[in-house]
């Protein structure tokens, strides 16, 4: 189920690559964030807190990613036209409860000016 399109700028282009921003409420302490391309899982990141507030970050499908207190950024490099697709941030909230899954996304348009290695 798609909960909605992202209510923020999800794609940030730089240097022939794209940063895909997946936001989560900053109150959330433990969660899993997956980046989906169409229906395929491209990347995932899980943040858990153990005893003594020790934070653990795990990735089963690793992508270059960056975690902040309210977002996960996934980075895709060497853009080409095949990257054009619907991308979704699939957030599973574990703590604080209730458990909640949300799917938000948008379409990544690829324009010539954003490609990594343009022929001059």
């Amino acid at each position: 189920e798609i909960n909605g399109s992202a209510n923020y700028e999800m794609f940030i282009f730089h240097n022939g690559g794209v940063q895909i921003l997946c936001k989560y409420p900053d109150i959330v302490q433990q969660f899993k964030m997956q980046l989906l391309k169409g229906g395929q899982i491209l990347c995932d990141l899980t943040k858990t807190k153990g005893s003594g507030n020790t934070v653990s970050i795990k990735s089963l499908k690793f992508c270059h990613s960056q975690l902040s207190n309210n977002s996960v950024s996934f980075f895709l490099y060497n853009l080409d036209h095949s990257h054009a697709n619907y991308y979704f941030c699939n957030l599973s909230i574990f703590d604080p409860p209730p458990f909640k899954v949300t799917l938000t996304g948008g379409y990544l348009h690829i324009y010539e000016s954003q490609l990594c290695c343009q022929l001059k």
């Epitope: 209510n7 936001k23 900053d26 703590d95 604080p96 409860p97 209730p98 949300t102």
Partner: antibody, heavy 121, light 106 residues
């Protein structure tokens, strides 16, 4: 139906502590976090903090850090908010509120009826 | 701290009229929620995620906005709508409420 029932009104002396309770019913207590919010007379609402019932993780508004302690007793489905070193400006109605999420954010979906705490010498 | 400024502080209208309440944030927030409070009662959730109607809330209530400017609209006021309305942001810690708009009968 989902209900949050709070303890009765309290009158406290400056420098003392107060502990307000919030008993949940109509849902599985550990499946939601609980927030505390206060409202001074004629004033707006102020978020104090929350507790994740199943992990015991707490998150406090820095304004109250060191003075507020939020706890929960799973066996009785009751959340507690204790405020210490009371001063006259802590006179307020204290509310518990259940945590919930939308697609983008979190909010309080169910509230207790409120507990009036009066701090007076 | 993100400061939420609600305007007007008091709004005097008659039943059947349209009410527009504003909430301005001191910096950008991702979403806004709205609560209604009547004297001697706890607040009640009206709108969450900027525009979604909470369970049991009549369709005359609606919310909109983005960034720093958000609006609660009541399309045609009913007698039971006269109350205090608060906006709330949970985007930036510490989480804050507006000071409230009192909607009173003209």
């Amino acid at each position: 139906q989902v209900q949050l029932v709070q303890s009765g009104a309290e009158v406290k002396k400056p420098g003392s502590s107060v502990k307000v309770s919030c008993k949940a019913s109509g849902y599985t207590f550990t499946d939601y976090a609980m927030h505390w919010v206060r409202q001074a007379p004629g004033q707006g609402l102020e978020w104090m903090g929350l507790i994740s019932i199943y992990s015991d993780h707490t998150n406090y508004n820095q304004k109250f850090q060191g003075r507020v302690t939020i706890t929960a007793d799973k066996s009785t489905s009751t959340a507690y908010m204790e405020l210490s070193s009371l001063r006259s400006e802590d006179t307020a109605v204290y509310y518990c509120g259940r945590n919930n999420y939308g697609n983008y954010g979190w909010y309080f979906d169910v509230w207790g009826q409120g507990t009036t705490v009066t701090v007076s010498s | 701290e993100i400061v939420l400024t609600q305007s007007p502080a008091t709004l005097s209208l008659s039943p059947g009229e349209r009410a527009t309440l504003s909430c301005s944030a001191s910096s950008s927030v991702s979403y806004m929620h709205w609560y209604q409070q009547k004297p001697g009662q706890a607040p009640r959730l009206l709108i969450y995620d900027t525009s979604k109607l909470a369970s049991g809330i009549p369709a005359r209530f609606s919310g909109s906005g983005s960034g720093t400017d958000y609006t609660l609209t009541i399309s045609s006021l009913e007698p039971e709508d006269f109350a205090v309305y608060y906006c709330f942001q949970g985007s930036g810690y510490p989480y804050t409420f507006g000071q409230g708009t009192k909607l009173e009968i003209k």
